[in-house]
Interface confidence: medium
């Protein structure tokens, strides 16, 4: 028997520095977790102790903090090189700055293979990108070889900016021939490493003949066997075992997100490359693990330029941006409108002639808007200003919901109106009218939404049985502020870009902004 240790990360999302327990900015260092300096300490410990070790990443290193805003992916290549990753799969967020923003800082600079079997380049891009990412890679490990095949969510064109010269094929259809090719090369130990979410990971384990292990990402799935060490609730045991269609037991793993855990899976293979046993658990990278001093010094050095960025002007406002709780928790506020407009603008994807865009709606809890911005400071807006408005380090995500769920969400928005509570929704692409004289749960008297399948966008009544795409904060997607119905009833959830980054990009693009209160939210006569 031959034993392999797989160390894995996924959805790190620019958390190069240690973070608080909830993966936001580290405040009390003695309680902080993760970060590449701490990860390196643990990886080196394991490399010294065990003979056959692979360090793999399942995508979405890009996007999530000011590190990515400033360094644009160069930080990913640099620190992944420093940690000596063995392979990475492309995630959807790796395309956030377009194909060029992937090629130059990451694909050309990475000293490890970057993989995806279901992304096919065409046109002029084909020759430009040739060899910079691969469908698979055969890695020597000790005296053996291990094949790694990559895959990426086929939803990427809706979630990011890959352009028109990359085709995202069905994962299973694309993976099978590459695995077959590995088999003909006498590679009998094959890991599928990819970024399509836990449900697809399990399908790959079930359907793709010859895959021995699946290491996934995208859904931020936390798996654990035994008592979990932190706040995350396991979605299943680690590894999650799937019985394949040809009767094999295939371990599937994922390691939550944000570099908080290092996935640790030990696999035992027989001489024919069959998995005999698999066991392990994610390792919580808490403060009991010291940060490696050389990587930490490198992080400190890179930090110098970040601090200065946060005070630079992104653009100007010529109006007061009312982010006060007195406004945003009671009525339409222009800060809410600005943020929602930025959220929609960030998700413009012209992928189909029938649709002007794939999504037109935004909802945003008023309680998530934490500060106004005064235009009398020469109109200047900085990252620092925006960090006061959106201090929680969240993301603006894409969900699919039925109209009936949206209706419940808007009822929840005003179910206890008047108490300055955070659930009052700010909107974009939605016209809502409330009648507060009616009883809670029956206060939404009009709910019109902007069409997407139209050449001239207009507002139509919400249909209860129709499925709609909506952009919203991850906080709401996870049921925050009492929006349990969103969490329970959502049909799809894809994590998006860092909230501040979305708004800062929009302001930089617009240069001068002047959001108004324009009748998105109304109260019917006599009730307000």
């Amino acid at each position: 028997a031959w034993e392999l240790t797989i160390l894995h990360t996924n959805d790190v999302h620019s958390r190069l520095e240690q973070t608080s327990e909830d993966s936001s900015k580290c405040v009390n260092a003695s309680r902080c977790m993760g970060g590449v300096a701490r990860l390196f300490t643990k990886v080196q410990q394991i490399r010294r102790a065990e003979p056959n070790v692979l360090l793999l990443d399942a995508g979405d290193q890009y996007q999530g903090t000011i590190w990515f805003t400033v360094y644009k992916g160069a930080e990913v290549a640099h620190f992944m090189n420093a940690l000596r990753y063995d392979a990475m799969a492309l995630g959807n967020h790796e395309f956030d700055n377009g194909v060029e923003g992937l090629i130059e800082p990451l694909l050309k600079e990475a000293k490890f293979p970057i993989l995806s079997a279901n992304i096919k380049a065409k046109g002029p891009l084909a020759s430009q990108i040739s060899g910079l990412y691969l469908p698979y890679k055969v890695l020597p490990v000790g005296d053996e070889v291990v094949g790694i095949v990559g895959y990426t969510s086929k939803e990427t064109p809706f979630l990011s900016n890959p352009g028109t010269n990359l085709v995202f094929e069905d994962e299973i259809t694309a993976l099978q021939p590459e695995v077959d090719k590995l088999k003909t090369l006498n590679v009998n130990k094959i890991i599928a490493l990819g970024h399509s979410g836990f449900e697809m990971d399990k399908l790959i384990a079930q359907k793709v003949r010859g895959v021995d292990v699946v290491v996934g990402g995208h859904s931020n799935t936390f798996l654990y066997t035994g008592n979990p060490p932190s706040k995350e609730v396991p979605a299943g045991k680690y590894p999650f075992i799937v019985t394949s269609d040809d009767g094999r037991k295939v371990p599937v793993v994922q390691a939550y997100a944000f570099g908080k855990y290092l996935g640790y899976l030990k696999i035992e293979f027989d001489e024919r490359g069959n998995v005999i046993s698999s066991h392990g658990n994610p390792i919580l990278l808490n403060s009991s693990i010291p940060e490696d001093p050389s990587i930490k010094a490198d992080i400190n050095k890179w930090r110098i330029k970040l601090d200065n960025y946060s005070t630079q002007e992104l653009g100007k406002t010529i109006v007061y941006l009312d982010g006060s709780s007195q406004s945003c928790r009671f009525r339409e506020c222009n800060m809410g409108n600005l943020i929602c407009d930025a959220m929609i603008n960030n998700n413009l994807r012209h992928t189909d002639e029938m649709f002007w865009n794939h999504v037109s709606m935004c909802i945003l809890n008023g309680g998530g808007i934490r500060s106004p911005i005064d235009e009398r400071n020469n109109g200047t807006i900085t990252w620092e200003n925006l960090a006061a408005v959106l201090p929680f380090g969240g993301t603006f995500d894409l969900v699919q919901l039925k109209g009936s769920t949206l209706k419940k969400a808007f009822e929840h928005s005003v179910h206890r109106y008047g108490q300055s509570t955070g659930e009052f929704l700010q909107v974009g692409g939605i016209h809502v009218v409330y009648d507060l004289s009616r009883k809670p749960g029956d206060r939404v008297v009009k709910l019109d939404v902007l069409c997407t399948k139209c050449r001239v966008p207009s507002y139509d009544p919400l249909k209860m049985d129709e499925v709609y795409k909506v952009i919203l904060p991850n906080f709401l997607a996870n049921g925050g502020d009492g929006f349990q119905m969103i969490k329970d009833e959502l049909l799809r959830h894809d994590s998006g870009d860092q909230d501040i980054n979305v708004v800062s990009t929009y302001i930089s693009k617009m240069k001068v902004i002047y959001p108004a209160v324009e009748g998105r939210i109304k109260f019917s006569t006599g009730s307000h």
């Epitope: 644009k72 130059e104 800082p105 010094a297 890179w302 330029k305 200065n308």
Partner: antibody
Framework: EVQLVQSGAEVKKPGATVKISCKVS????????ITWIRQPPGKGLEWIGD????????NYNEKFKTRVTISADKSISTAYLQWSSLKASDTAMYYC???????????????WGQGTLVTVSS | EIVLTQSPDFQSVTPKEKVTITCRAS??????????MHWYQQKPGKAPKLLIY???NLESGIPPRFSGSGYGTDFTLTINNIESEDAAYYFC?????????FGQGTKVEIK
């Protein structure tokens, strides 16, 4: 081989604007900061500011901020320094330099251009 | 901003002598065991050239007679067995915070 090649000498009148260029080759232009430094005749070195070509982010010395614009064109791997409202005291040799901040030099300036002499005189 | 003060301003030495140039920072430029101080050599009509980075690391291609030391606010550039080709200006520079600044320079003359 890493090279930074600057544009030629300039003679300008007070109040005018000058734009000098720095074309780089031999490394990934978008992944390293480019710094601009000036040296008046017979004097020391002054840090003007820098740019990260990958994102266009810039930092400026407060002393010069109102008159200086640093930019970069990724497509031709070239950084620019534009200086407006020139005064006689701006007469100096202007250098571009590559910061080694993504390796081990920690923002030390590991490669320099040959310099561009800007003379401001009426 | 951090002010760097070099001493001496001028030094005249004979070949094979040892030269020591100091650079004092108005504020600590070291952290996490690293010192963000660098040394450059500039010959007349030429661009400066990096000699030492991070206080004590010799840039590749620089002869080993050049060395650097220091931590916190006080740093030293030493040239052992100085040669005639070492006649030049020498500058220190910090990169601890923005703006980065340079010392005023030390002129080394070989008799």
């Amino acid at each position: 081989e890493v090279q930074l090649v600057q544009s030629g000498a300039e003679v300008k009148k007070p109040g005018a604007t000058v734009k000098i260029s720095c074309k780089v080759s031999g490394y990934t232009f978008t992944s390293y900061w480019i710094t601009w430094i000036r040296q008046p005749p017979g004097k020391g070195l002054e840090w003007i500011g820098d740019i990260y070509p990958g994102s266009g982010n810039t930092n400026y010395n407060e002393k010069f901020k109102t008159r200086v614009t640093i930019s970069a064109d990724k497509s031709i791997s070239t950084a620019y320094l534009q200086w407006s409202s020139l005064k006689a005291s701006d007469t100096a040799m202007y250098y571009c330099a590559k910061e080694g901040g993504l390796t081990t030099e920690d923002y030390a300036l590991d490669y320099w251009g040959q310099g561009t002499l800007v003379t401001v005189s009426s | 901003e951090i002010v760097l003060t070099q001493s001496p301003d001028f030094q005249s030495v004979t070949p094979k002598e040892k030269v020591t140039i100091t650079c004092r920072a108005s504020k600590n430029v070291s952290t996490s065991g690293y010192s963000y101080m660098h040394w450059y050599q500039q010959k007349p009509g030429k661009a400066p050239k990096l000699l030492i980075y991070l206080a004590s690391n010799l840039e590749s291609g620089i002869p080993p007679r050049f060395s650097g030391s220091g931590y916190g606010t006080d740093f030293t550039l030493t040239i052992n067995n100085i040669e005639s080709e070492d006649a030049a200006y020498y500058f220190c520079q910090h990169s601890r915070e923005l703006p980065f600044t340079f010392g005023q320079g030390t002129k080394v003359e070989i008799k």
